[in-house]
Interface confidence: low
């Protein structure tokens, strides 16, 4: 798949559209002006303190514990409803989510609240689902969940290999750590950093601390951010955006599928995420967050997924001549952007089609066997096979190859699900182009 650029085919008559949202970033400049950025950061930090304390005192209490019961209905603000609510069908009301059953974390125009995650067996519930926050699950004692296999808790090793000594205990997010007695190097050969032996977690429930402690912590974060602003200048938003967008599941995609890695301790406490939600109380679509994006990129016509349908009014004859191409929304590497979404595909592609799909994509039976053997667990199998496919085919591993393979297999609904998911996650968007110039 080519990356979008000056020479990308332009759709005749199409023009750049932003996703529907409450406001547009007007008069965007090539780079952020530092004073304005500083003001935003400071404002964000101050808001963060008050917002966090408000969240703790109000939103995390069960309904019966709140001072005043939340109204069942209220009116949408600029077409969006606040966290803890979803919009009614007619768009006139905001209806509250059901405590303990479903939730919404941001300003939204969801027709339904998202269903609460239930912790798997082998997990403990760290914090319950509220109307504004999903359940947080953590591996039970003696097990851990690592980055490479976020879907399951794995048993911690009981001891270190011969000639090694234990320097770190089993925690819900890491196995025991072992180092060689003589050299002091970890099993992997790295020299252990001091921090690596610390077993406390940012994700464990914080003990009640004074406001001054919060302010000190936040101030440090602010200083770091201010330095970053000066260093990065115009690159700031480009650098921050990938973090803001989160991994594929994090963008309002499949409500059935909650990516567990986003629920691992600390993941939801990302300062960047907090700042964005404060700076954008009405959830400005991601395309509008890139404030220094040139007002009109030359030679390329981008369509946000939410508005692309308005350009699809030509006759069927013309429509058949065109192919709507999925491209990364943030101009990232197409193959890498797709790879970040693989973890979700196991829920979207029927199990019986996993192997036929991989054969269709060019994996040999032996490679499939190896992938199955390497997979951490059943759910991880498709992910592992897809990674093998990417490693094998490199730049040729495109979203369209994958979708076409599903179509060929007759898995049209799986194809639809993945296409929808890639769009609603905010990772991909449509580039309107001619079928004969379709990028793969």
């Amino acid at each position: 798949m080519e990356q979008r650029g000056q020479n990308a085919p332009a759709a005749s008559g199409a023009r750049k559209r932003h996703g529907p949202g409450p406001r547009e970033a007007r008069g965007a400049r090539p780079g952020p002006r530092v004073p304005k950025t500083l003001v935003l950061v400071v404002a964000a930090v101050l808001l963060l303190v008050s917002a966090e304390s408000a969240l703790i005192t109000q939103q995390d209490l069960a309904p019966q514990q709140r001072a005043a019961p939340q109204q069942k209905r209220s009116s949408p603000s600029e077409g969006l409803c606040p966290p803890g609510h979803h919009i009614s069908e007619d768009g006139r009301d905001c209806i509250s989510c059901k405590y303990g059953q479903d939730y919404s974390t941001h300003w939204n125009d969801l027709l339904f609240c998202l269903r609460c995650t239930r912790c798997d067996s082998g997990e403990v519930e760290l914090s319950p689902c509220t109307t504004t926050r999903n359940t947080v699950c953590q591996c039970e004692e003696g097990t851990f969940r690592e980055e490479d296999s976020p879907e399951m808790c794995r048993k911690c090793r009981t001891g270190c290999p011969r000639g090694m000594v234990k320097v770190g205990d089993c925690t819900p997010w890491s196995d025991i750590e072992c180092v060689h007695k003589e050299s002091g190097t970890k099993h992997s050969g790295e020299v252990p950093a001091v921090e690596e032996t610390v077993t406390s977690s940012p994700g464990t429930p914080a003990s009640p601390c004074s406001l001054s402690g919060i302010i000190i912590g936040v101030t440090v974060a602010a200083v770091v951010l201010i330095v970053a602003v000066f260093v990065c200048k115009s690159l700031l938003w480009k650098k921050v955006l990938p973090y803001l967008k989160g991994i594929c599941s994090g963008g309002g995609g499949d409500p059935e599928r909650v990516d567990r890695s986003s629920q691992r301790p600390g993941a939801e406490d990302n300062v960047l995420n907090e700042i964005v939600s404060i700076l954008q109380p009405t959830q400005v679509p991601e395309q509008e967050m890139e404030v220094q994006e040139p007002a009109e990129p030359t030679g390329v016509n981008m369509l946000s997924p939410g508005e692309s349908e308005h350009l699809l009014e030509p006759a069927e004859a013309e429509r058949s001549q065109r192919r709507r191409l999925l491209v990364p929304a943030n101009e990232g590497d197409p193959t890498e952007t797709l790879r970040q979404c693989f973890d979700d595909f196991a829920d979207l592609v029927p199990f019986d089609s996993w192997e036929p799909l991989m054969r269709k994509l060019g994996l040999m039976d032996n490679e499939i066997k190896v992938a199955k053997a390497e997979a951490a667990g059943h759910r991880d199998t498709l992910y592992t096979m897809l990674i093998k496919w990417v490693n094998k085919t490199g730049r040729d591993a495109s979203v369209h190859t994958l979708l076409d393979a599903l179509e060929t297999l007759g898995e049209r609904l799986a194809k639809q699900k993945i296409e929808d998911h890639l769009l609603s996650s905010g990772k991909f968007m449509y580039l309107e182009g001619n079928a004969d110039s379709a990028m793969s």
Epitope: G19, E89, L110, G252, L312, R319, D347, P350, F351, D420
Partner: antibody, heavy 126, light 107 residues
Framework: QLVESGGGVVQPGRSLRLSCAAS????????MHWVRQAPGKGLEWVAV????????YYADSVKGRFTISRDNSKNTLYLQMNSLRAEDTAVYYC?????????????????????WGQGTTVTVSS | DIQMTQSPSSLSASVGDRVTITCRAS??????LAWFQQKPGKAPKSLIY???SLQSGVPSKFSGSGSGTDFTLTISSLQPEDFATYYC?????????FGGGTKVEIK
């Protein structure tokens, strides 16, 4: 909220066009289905069209003969039935796919069909 | 195509009974399963989506469970208005398919 029309008695090989008028909800935000039920039999899915009309899928038994379409400006769903056969005799229901939408991006595979019309009867007989 | 097999095809029960209907998919469908209730001469009514989630407005006496290939619809305490035909439907892949139906009759 969904009212089907256009049913009737028709001879084999002839054509018929069914309509489904929607009201009470934002029609253009939902995928729509046709489902049929032959006399004394179970339910059979016929076709689906996405909210924007860009994707359409059909049951093998009607592929190439039936065409699903929609006019969002008129809040109406259609089923054009050509080359009708005796086995197409059934009550035809239109049904709304429950959608999950955020920022104008809708996905239609989470919640199934929640709103159904009362049906219109199609009889194919010589 | 994914075949959906419902059992039993019919059952007789009394008011107050606990009734269980099963549905089996010919291949794994995750939790992409819905249950519908249909009364004679009427359109189907959606009861459950995503295998276990209750459609809004549906009484809690209805519950669904299962994932993969085996699914269950349970009516905890049968009431006169519950005598009807129940269908399961998969929406994991096209073509969408329904089970053959289970007719719940008064004993």
């Amino acid at each position: 909220q969904l009212v089907e029309s256009g049913g009737g008695v028709v001879q084999p090989g002839r054509s018929l066009r069914l309509s489904c008028a929607a009201s009470g909800f934002t029609f253009s935000s939902y995928g729509m289905h046709w489902v049929r039920q032959a006399p004394g039999k179970g339910l059979e899915w016929v076709a689906v069209i996405w909210y924007d009309g860009r994707n359409k899928y059909y049951a093998d038994s009607v592929k190439g003969r039936f065409t699903i379409s929609r006019d969002n400006s008129k809040n109406t769903l259609y089923l054009q039935m050509n080359s009708l056969r005796a086995e197409d005799t059934a009550v035809y229901y239109c049904a709304r796919e429950v959608g999950y939408c955020t920022n104008g991006v809708c996905s239609y595979y989470y919640y199934g069909m929640d709103v159904w019309g009362q049906g219109t009867t199609v009889t194919v007989s010589s | 195509d994914i075949q959906m097999t419902q059992s039993p095809s019919s059952l007789s029960a009394s008011v107050g009974d606990r009734v269980t209907i099963t549905c089996r998919a010919s291949q794994g469908i995750s939790n992409y399963l819905a249950w519908f209730q249909q009364k004679p001469g009427k359109a189907p009514k959606s009861l459950i989506y995503a295998a276990s989630s209750l459609q809004s407005g549906v009484p809690s006496k209805f519950s669904g469970s299962g994932s993969g290939t085996d699914f269950t619809l349970t009516i905890s305490s049968l009431q006169p208005e519950d005598f009807a035909t129940y269908y399961c439907q998969q929406y994991n892949s096209y073509p969408l398919t329904f089970g053959g139906g289970t007719k719940v009759e008064i004993k």
